[in-house]
Amino acid sequence: LTCLGGFASPGPVPPSTALRELIEELVNITQNQKAPLCNGSMVWSINLTAGMYCAALESLINVSGCSAIEKTQRMLSGFCPHKVSAGQFSSLHVRDTKIEVAQFVKDLLLHLKKLFREGQFN
């Protein structure tokens, strides 16, 4: 095999694969959780039926210094068509309840699994 220099860019990721990879990462987080996730940090709860990818990112991006969710943050940034920065709450129209990151991840995981089962890859 000849190396043509640099890294071959990975092929296009179908939405179904992208969603499955996010689910796998969230499963990984919940299964490997020993101590309280992100030291028990609290994040805004989101409406999982309203533009959830950007909303989830807007909520989680405010957690810093938590390596356990960095990959999730990175993946969600690719699931949102606009750039999200810490402190930005454009998609989070209602901010009234804070929950622990661990609970947020569990809720998001359950919802994404449901979408995947139903074939909703959009």
């Epitope: 990721v13 939405p15 992208a18 969603l19 039926t49 309203a50 533009g51 959830m52 990818y53 950007c54 940034s77 690719g78 699931f79 949102c80 068509p81 606009h82 750039k83 920065s85 930005q88 454009s90 998609s91 074939g119 909703q120 890859f121 959009n122």
Partner: antibody, heavy 118, light 109 residues
């Protein structure tokens, strides 16, 4: 005032590559995703991809994954689109556009016409 | 690959209300498709009108509104004006990429 200034028209040979630029003024590109869209003559729009200029992270439409390469230079506030292995069907006007929650596809460059012909 | 379908032509009169729709071949359009509407006027003048299903871009007149109607995204022009004559493209987000519809030509007679 927000403006996106794109490079001039290009006439290129089949099989060649072309590098298009989009220089922003009135805002810092690292604060936004920059999207690229094409329009073939008298046809609709096709989304090519987007880049986060801050870290270079990209997403591409499946059909352009092996054809388009998006890059950005934050020091010159410029986004780039390289299109490779050009064929006659790649003749189109290519647009850069700024996208954010409050202004989705709100600002567009003037477009760059790329003509692929022998 | 999903296909996004729009009406090809719609005709309305000044002051009337017209609704354009955007259908996804993969099923119901949801808020996670972040439906966008872009207006094209002659000489390739593009304006983003709506993003995130119903978020009107700054400076866009209030007569333009976005929503979900049934299983489709919709753009409603309430009280159409002659200057609204244009081609309107919808774009739907599929987790990691946009797909544009083929556009609806709106004529205001």
């Amino acid at each position: 005032e927000v403006q996106l200034q794109q490079s001039g028209a290009e006439l290129v040979l089949p099989g060649a590559s072309v590098l298009l630029s989009c220089t922003a003024s009135g805002f810092n590109i690292k604060d936004y995703y920059m999207h690229w869209v094409l329009q073939r003559t008298e046809q609709g729009l096709e989304w090519i991809g987007r880049i986060d200029p801050e870290d270079g992270e990209t997403k591409y439409a499946p059909k352009f994954h092996d054809k388009a390469t998006l890059t950005a230079d934050t020091s010159s506030n410029t986004a780039y689109l390289q299109f490779s292995s050009l064929a006659s069907e790649d003749t189109a006007v290519y647009y850069c556009t700024r996208y954010d929650y409050y202004g989705p596809f709100a600002y567009w460059g003037q477009g760059t016409l790329v003509t692929v012909s022998a | 690959q999903a296909v996004v379908t729009q009406e090809s032509v719609l005709t309305t009169s000044p002051g009337e209300t017209v609704t354009l729709t955007c259908r996804s071949s993969t099923g119901a359009v949801t808020t996670s498709n972040y439906a966008n509407w872009v207006q094209e006027k002659p000489d390739h003048l593009f304006t983003g009108l709506i993003g995130g299903t119903n978020n009107r871009a700054p400076g866009v007149p209030a007569r333009f509104s976005g929503s979900l109607i049934g299983d489709k995204a919709a753009l409603t022009i309430t009280g159409a004006q002659t200057e609204d004559e244009a081609i309107y493209f919808c774009a739907l987000w599929y987790i990691n990429h946009f797909i544009f519809g083929s556009g609806t030509k709106v004529t205001v007679l």
